[in-house]
Amino acid sequence: EDELQVIQPEKSVSVAAGESATLRCAMTSLIPVGPIMWFRGAGAGRELIYNQKEGHFPRVTTVSELTKRNNLDFSISISNITPADAGTYYCVKFRKGSPDDVEFKSGAGTELSVRAKPS
């Protein structure tokens, strides 16, 4: 069986300020079991944007129903984009672990750029 791949099809996305940004991510397998998280940045200081398991992310909605059986689409939409939201976003799969989940595989990242609001 092929190992799970995390696919972020767009290398970059450009959105006008005030609009919503859709960041696409898909898995190629349901295995291993475990949550996905979205981060901005790739280093030790990366910022958590969305956690499938827990947390409060008022500006983030999932494009598909993540709890739906056999779902492989983990795309998100971030509302009311501002220039401060620019950056590279990573979709990351975690493997369920005890006591903590373990990072399994990351997508290649999608760079979000923000255009000035049309006047």
């Epitope: 981060f39 940045g41 030790a44 200081g45 990366r46 910022e47 958590l48 409060h56």
Partner: antibody, heavy 117, light 108 residues
Framework: DVQLVESGGGLVRPGESLRLSCAAS????????VTWVRQAPGEGLEWVSL???????YYADSVKGRFTISRDNSKSTLYLQMNSLRAEDTAVYYC???????????WGLGTLVTVSS | EIVLTQSPGTLSVSPGERATFSCRAS??????LAWYQQKPGQAPRLLIY???TRATGIPARFSGSGSGTEFTLTISSLQSEDFAVYYC??????????FGGGTKVEIK
């Protein structure tokens, strides 16, 4: 407004322990890495330790094996457990919020740790 | 570990003058270089990151330049509130995050 307030500093003898706390407010604590930086009297800044949003920990060589960083997301609080303290650990200890660019954009006012016999 | 060397150690400048000081890295950090300002008895304040991007609320008189191993912070016209110690920090993706030894900007 983002606020970071350190506490727990004081005077201890070499070999003793101390636990520092940093209470955070004004941002979603769970979504950011947080770090400790120290400054010995009259000296420059020295990075000490960082804990990521997923709980991964990093340490400077000078404190590895003696200091433990941790976070309680339910309390929006960062901790630094300092064991086997040495005179050279004497410093003001600052906690700071870490941006996704790995820079420190908000700092507390610091808490003074003095290690002396 | 990347070592950052700042020069000069102290810079004496008159208000209204231009101040320029440097930070040299022992190995390349690309553009991952930040600058902080610290006044006596206060916490450091982030000024610049990614070598030349001003942090939120930082006046335009502060500018950063450089890449690789050589970086410069310039204050175009020194105000009284700018007299302080300035530290550079490399912010590559992974720790340790090292700081330079600092440059003290004092009134001439």
């Amino acid at each position: 407004d983002v606020q970071l307030v350190e506490s727990g500093g004081g005077l201890v003898r070499p070999g003793e322990s101390l636990r520092l706390s940093c209470a955070a407010s004004g941002f979603t604590f769970t979504n950011y890495a947080v770090t400790w930086v120290r400054q010995a009297p009259g000296e420059g800044l020295e990075w000490v330790s960082l804990i990521s949003v997923t709980g991964t920990t990093y340490y400077a060589d000078s404190v590895k094996g003696r200091f433990t960083i941790s976070r309680d997301n339910s309390k929006s609080t960062l901790y630094l457990q300092m064991n086997s303290l040495r005179a050279e650990d004497t410093a003001v200890y600052y906690c700071a919020k870490v941006t996704w660019k790995n820079v420190f954009d908000y700092w507390g006012l610091g808490t003074l740790v003095t290690v002396s016999s | 570990e990347i070592v950052l060397t700042q020069s000069p150690g102290t810079l004496s400048v008159s208000p209204g003058e231009r101040a320029t000081f440097s930070c040299r890295a022992s190995q390349t950090v690309g553009s991952k270089l930040a600058w902080y300002q610290q006044k006596p008895g206060q916490a450091p304040r982030l000024l610049i990151y990614d070598a030349n991007t001003r942090a939120t609320g930082i006046p335009a008189r502060f500018s950063g330049s450089g890449s690789g191993t050589e970086f410069t912070l310039t204050i175009s016209s020194l105000q009284s509130e700018d007299f302080a110690v300035y530290y550079c920090q490399q912010h590559t993706d992974w720790p340790p995050y090292t700081f330079g030894g600092g440059t003290k900007v004092e009134i001439k």
